[in-house]
């Protein structure tokens, strides 16, 4: 039975230019993470193995670095990078929990944080 | 006692292939991630490329991508580099290792790939 | 890819002397680094992992600090048996990347 919940830094928005980082935590299991895949609408932004580290895909290598912790640092956002980002945690025996972020990329300055949220 | 047994290496054209094998014994080998790690003459270590446990994902090196395959055979308890394309800078020694805490605890004797007319 | 940078190429030393090699990563890899020793014809051995974990059966006078970038693996008081070259090894992320080597040569 899978008990665990992902807790995401939920909608968020950003202005062109800047950087976000997007955040998963996967609380209330005790089971082991093998591996976490971020990836955004089907492609995949990388991956980082509990047994090899890191792995940023090669076509986003330029403008997302691992970290902090789990989580994922986006660069020089463009307007295009606006859209859902999916945090999949690969457990041990739980199996998959995934969380959802959407991220907006804001012309202005007016881009603010929205709240954290949960995912059962 | 925990082993790693590498074979397959020789004398091969530039542009031809090889596979190089390394049989595992002593331990569990489908809970590790594995990697091939290879040295030239006289240099130092060059990371190739690494198979997570399950074989689900394979990584490699940019100098490789696209000629190496890794692959792994977990009934067998064997880990296996495909080698294409073969290059006189691909001529070294081949060694494959197991991953535990990030870092490569377990590793063969190594089997010399030798790229030469 | 994160390069690694380390120092000295080589050195020389006598049975007894205290030896430092460093590491640098040219970013921070937090504390995913390893140290191997390796000597002519053979293949690596694993001492050190994650900075400063001595590996099971490896002996106690080898020893290693660090996290961020800069790195440092420590022979209290070197034997004969530890005359090898020495590489650093960054597992933070792919592609892992070795320091390029030192060798630690007889006085």
């Known amino acids: 039975m899978m008990t665990g919940t992902i807790e995401t830094t939920g909608n968020i928005s950003a202005e062109k230019g800047g950087s976000i980082i997007l955040q998963c935590h996967l609380s209330s299991t005790t089971a082991q993470v093998t591996q976490v895949n971020w990836e955004q609408q089907d492609q995949l932004l990388a991956i980082c193995n509990a047994d090899l580290g890191w792995h940023i895909s090669p076509s986003f290598k330029d403008r997302v670095a691992p970290g902090p912790g789990l989580g994922l640092t986006l660069q020089s956002l463009t307007v295009n990078d606006t859209g859902e980002y999916f945090c999949i945690y690969h457990t041990y025996p739980d199996g998959t929990y995934t969380g959802r972020i959407f991220l907006e990329v804001l012309e202005s300055s007016v881009a603010e944080h929205g709240a954290r949220f949960q995912i059962p | 006692e925990v082993q790693l047994l590498e074979s397959g290496g020789g004398l091969v054209q530039p542009g031809g292939s090889l596979r190089l094998s390394c049989a595992a014994s002593g331990f569990r080998f489908g809970n590790y991630a594995m990697s091939w790690v290879r040295q030239a003459p006289g240099k130092g270590l060059e990371w190739v490329s690494a198979?997570?446990?399950?074989?689900?994902?394979?990584f490699y090196a940019d100098s490789v991508k696209g000629r190496f395959t890794i692959s792994r055979d977990n009934s067998k308890n064997t880990l296996y580099l495909q080698i294409n394309s073969l290059r006189a800078e691909d001529t070294a020694v081949y060694y494959c290792?197991?991953?535990?805490?990030?870092?490569?605890?377990?590793w063969g004797q190594g089997t010399l790939v030798t790229v030469s007319s | 890819d994160i390069q690694m940078t380390q120092s000295p190429s080589s050195l020389s030393a006598s049975v007894g002397d205290r030896v430092t090699i460093t590491c640098r990563a040219s970013q921070t890899i937090i504390t995913y680094l390893n140290w191997y020793q390796q000597k002519p014809g053979k293949a690596p051995k694993l001492l050190i992992y994650?900075?400063?974990n001595l590996r099971s059966g490896v002996p106690s006078r080898f020893s290693g600090s660090g996290s961020g970038t800069d790195f440092t693996l420590t022979i209290s008081s070197l034997q004969p048996e530890d005359f090898a070259t020495y590489y650093c090894q960054q597992s933070y992320s792919l592609p892992w990347t070795f320091g390029g080597g030192t060798k630690v040569e007889i006085k």
């Open positions: 994650a900075a400063s």
């Open positions: 290792a197991r991953v535990r805490n990030r870092a490569s605890d377990i």
């Open positions: 198979i997570t446990g399950s074989g689900g994902n394979t």
